[in-house]
Interface confidence: medium
């Protein structure tokens, strides 16, 4: 009689993550009498994936009932299965010996490999804010996937960005990988509504590739422009003046009125408006009474603006002239400015 | 229909004054942000003021070239824009035009954006400064 | 300041492009059929289409270049085309205007 030959027919198996493995294995005789065993790998170090005669192996099940006496099936189930499960994996037939069992013939091996998803991008961009012009860096991560072969993409408001280095890590072979990019972004003023999108694709996704963003409203500022303006005011003795912080971004501002280099009033942006790229306005005014001054008088509108430098725009008020006829850039009497914000 | 009608041109002397209005029809004129771009004889549009809707509190812009010489103002009740224009020179020569910008107020949302929103021109009226 | 092409031109029925390039604003785009006569929006905040201008008109924006696409060009259409946006000081500013010239 022919001796016995173990044969696994599936030289390789691809499974995705989480689905269930078939490792296929049959003998082609009865004799000699004994168990079978599945390892992966070869040689002293190799895992015992499933004895025939004892143990406890959850996540394996068998094809067949290899309880019946003429069974040569020994095919085997691997569920939820993970990267972590890919490798060679060994079909051993073992001659009843004692005290033990006797190796006695290997199939040639299946080798299982693991079709893994990648996680969501995670993309992350500067501790710290910057202003337009200057140049930031968003990283993205993502981690578990297999095989190696990926694309990741960086996108600005649906335009593909070019200035980026990626790096798929380890290098050499493994169960699973990262990749991990880093792109180079240029803030312009508008960025405030702006998205920064990672976009990885996969062979386990099916042509749906996976996206991270990030906000860049959480990595701008927008520094304010100050403008400071008299308006006429009926009163003989009392001069309006106003403050318009414009286009500042973000909304946290504080400002301060100083009459001769003293503090007048301190203020902080409260009731602003939005401009259509995100940036906030303000304005602030000051009622300055003429007649308690003998001097010309200095008014300076100084801005601080998320916790930057303070920044300032100076008005020089004349007292010995008429109120009316201060300051030319004017707005007229009836803009029907809001009262609550005259001081 | 959307209507800006300018007046108040004509020849004016060095150094004098200029007031240029403009009545506006046809559109809610408090909701929107107003401005001026005048054209000199063979060059191109240069802004020359604007100014933001009175609920917003934001005031005025100007353009560099009359910085400290203009004054816009505007009168919402009339739907009247007013551009007054001192220390007149020979460069302030050309067509000033009314325009209305898509840029406004609604709830917490203002613009300060004028030229690059501008969706109602006037037909002009002409300045000539000359002794 | 804001950069725009002195000239084009085009065959009736081709698409033409004109390019603005300033400080990454927004950008306007204004018609004028001759010198001092009233100019016509075609174009304004980059992409807005005022409801009397043909579909053949169309704005787009890439980084701090604005573009204005005539598609299937028309004699009509020749003009000059002034684009309007806001240097970095947030003054309004226009360029100096592109002639089109339909052939």
């Known amino acids: 009689e022919e001796e016995l030959q173990v044969i696994q027919p599936d030289k390789s198996v691809l499974v995705a993550a989480g689905e269930t493995a078939t490792l296929r294995c049959t003998a082609t005789s009865l004799i000699p009498v004994g168990p079978i065993q599945w390892f992966r790998g070869a040689g002293p170090g190799r895992e015992l994936i499933y004895n025939q005669k004892e143990g406890h192996f959850p996540r394996v099940t068998t094809v067949s009932d290899l309880t019946k006496r003429n069974n040569m099936d020994f095919s085997i189930r691997i569920g939820n299965i993970t990267p972590a499960d890919a490798g060679t994996y060994y079909c051993v037939k073992f001659r009843k010996g004692s005290p033990d069992d006797v190796e006695f013939k290997s199939g040639a091996g299946t080798e299982l490999s693991v079709r893994a998803k990648p996680s969501a991008p995670v993309v992350s961009g500067p501790a710290a804010r910057a202003t337009p012009q200057h140049t930031v860096s968003f990283t993205c991560e993502s981690h578990g996937f297999s095989p190696r072969d990926i694309t990741l993409k960086w996108f600005k408001n649906g335009n593909e960005l070019s200035d980026f280095q990626t790096n798929v890590d380890p290098v050499g072979e493994s169960v699973s990988y990262s990749i991990h990019s880093t792109a180079k972004v240029v803030l312009t003023r508008e960025d405030v509504h702006s998205q920064v999108i990672c976009e990885v694709a996969h062979v386990t996704l099916q042509g749906d590739p996976l996206r991270g963003t990030a906000n860049l409203s959480e990595t701008i500022r927008v520094p304010p422009t100050l403008e400071v303006t008299q308006q006429p005011v009926r009163a003989e003795n009392q001069v309006n003046v106003t403050c318009q912080v414009r286009k500042f971004y973000p909304q946290r501002l504080q400002l301060t009125w100083l009459e001769n280099g003293n503090v007048s009033r301190t203020e902080t942006a409260s009731t602003v408006t939005e401009n259509k790229d995100g940036t906030y306005n303000w304005m602030s005014w000051l009622l300055v009474n003429v007649s308690a001054h003998r001097d010309d008088v200095k008014l300076t509108c100084q801005v601080e603006h998320d916790g930057q430098p303070a920044v300032s725009k100076s008005h020089d008020l004349k007292v010995s002239a008429h109120p009316k006829e201060q300051g030319s850039n004017t707005a007229a009497e009836n803009t029907g400015s809001n009262e609550r914000n005259i001081y | 229909a959307v209507t800006l009608d300018e007046s108040g041109g004509g020849l004016q002397t060095p150094g004098g004054a200029l007031s240029l209005v403009c009545k506006a029809s046809g559109f809610t004129f408090s909701s929107y942000n107003m401005g001026w771009v005048r054209q000199a004889p063979g060059k191109g549009l240069e802004f020359v003021a604007g100014?933001?809707?009175?609920?917003?509190?934001?005031?005025?812009t100007y353009g560099a070239a009359v910085q400290g010489r203009a004054t816009i103002s505007r009168d919402d009740g009339q739907s009247t824009v007013r551009l007054q224009l001192n220390n007149l020179r020979a460069e302030d020569t050309g067509t000033y035009f009314c325009?209305?910008?898509?840029?406004?107020?609604?709830?917490?949302?203002?613009?300060?954006?004028?030229?690059?929103?501008?969706?109602?021109w006037g037909h002009g009226t002409e300045v000539i400064v000359s002794s | 300041a804001v950069t725009q092409p002195a000239s084009v031109s085009a065959n009736p029925g081709e698409t033409v492009k004109i390019t603005c390039s300033g400080d990454s604003s927004y950008y306007g785009w204004y018609q004028q059929k001759s010198p001092g006569s009233a100019p016509v929006t075609v174009i304004y905040d980059d992409n807005k289409r005022p409801s009397n201008i043909p579909s053949r008109f169309s704005g787009s924006k890439s980084g701090s270049t604005g573009t204005l696409t005539i598609t299937g060009v028309q004699a009509d259409d020749e003009a000059v085309y002034f684009c309007?946006?806001?240097?970095?000081?947030?003054?309004?500013?226009f360029g100096a205007g592109t002639t089109l010239t339909v052939l």
């Open positions: 309007g946006n806001e240097d970095n000081s947030y003054v309004a500013i």
């Open positions: 325009a209305k910008s898509a840029g406004g107020c609604s709830a917490h949302s203002c613009d300060t954006y004028i030229a690059d929103s501008i969706d109602a």
């Open positions: 100014i933001y809707i009175a609920s917003g509190d934001l005031g005025t």
